[in-house]
Amino acid sequence: FVRTKIDTTENLLNTEVHSSPAQRWSMQVPPEVSAEAGDAAVLPCTFTHPHRHYDGPLTAIWRAGEPYAGPQVFRCAAARGSELCQTALSLHGRFRLLGNPRRNDLSLRVERLALADDRRYFCRVEFAGDVHDRYESRHGVRLHVTAAPRIVNISVLPSPAHAFRALCTAEGEPPPALAWSGPALGNSLAAVRSPREGHGHLVTAELPALTHDGRYTCTAANSLGRSEASVYLFRFHGASGAST
């Protein structure tokens, strides 16, 4: 299920119109598209241009992160007069052109979404040959990837004075709430660290001091679901064994 956020203040879409008496380029992209991890999403992009009946060579490009300089994730090229835009680049084979650039449509389908795909994407078209022009969406479309929680790491670590602490890291969007439960704990939201820089979907919770042997369970929950994982603490002869 894919949701396209409509921004009524921008005439339903982010429409970038750049015109003068001799030229008129515009690109229409929605501000945001939402989809769940594992699903597919469509990034809509249509354009108008000042070159009437252009049928020369063209290249369609999508890039991620920032306009003009972000890494390309998709590129295809159409020869003069051809309606077929032959894919030259599709990152991890997950990007596919849905639109027909000859009909001013650069819409892109992204398969098997992952949280790492949650970023801004920019469509671009280049005309080559007799007419020599190019244009790129500067605002782009934000792909918002949602995901049920997944615990990516749970561990017991030594800490000073022969004590032990437990760490639980989970990912999800919205970022999940983490809770620890275990011997003499009840439910604890112990020391949740906010998402790390550059890892916006990761949340870590720490239990700073494990005072009893037994099973400690970390639960991650958001609006899309919950996940849990456990570690076991057994202390003997001043050492510990922990398993998950």
Partner: antibody
Amino acid sequence: EVQLVESDGGLVQPGRSLKLSCAASGFTFSDYYLAWVRQAPTKGLEWVASVSYEGITNYYRDSVKGRFTISRDNAKSTLSLQMDSLRSEDTATYYCARQDWEGGFAYWGQGTLVTVSS
Amino acid sequence: DIVMTQTPLSLSVTPGASASISCRSSKSLLHSPGLTYVFWYLQKPGRSPRLLIYRVSNLASGVPDRFRGSGSETDFTLKISRVEAEDVGIYYCGQLLENPFTFGSGTKLEIK
């Protein structure tokens, strides 16, 4: 680190041919247009030719059209310039450059001198 | 062809002073709002050219903020504040709006 390294140029007689090549590293080669820019001794910069991502589209300045051929090998990350029917006015240092449309000629090779003389 | 006209041809500057180079194009280099295809390059003696400024006013990677580009449409300026000895060389403006891509004839900066 982005690097562009041109092959050696040399002395060539008028009417003869020479092929220049440029080895690129440090970036995703096929994501960029590439170009050759030349500079005659004690003169300014003069764009020669550009080639598109897959090498489908080439652009040339009028004075070299029909004589020079720009090409690329994305598998080997190399750019080439085949120069035929060379003239004395083609004498110059030839630079290969990465052409970032909105970012200019962002990176340049060290240049290689081509001298056309009898 | 778009002609890029640079002035002055040369200038001699005292270290610490500022320098200004002008570039005029024979046609507007404005493609669309916020997108003007003019660039500045520096070629130090015996070296390859190096990108200084892209799209009128954006500093290329590693370029000190003593360099500042400005202008619009057909008139562009490169200003160097607090000139240093390492700034000597030939400065070129260039355009990537239309084929053939063209450069100015260059401005030679010397230190007094």
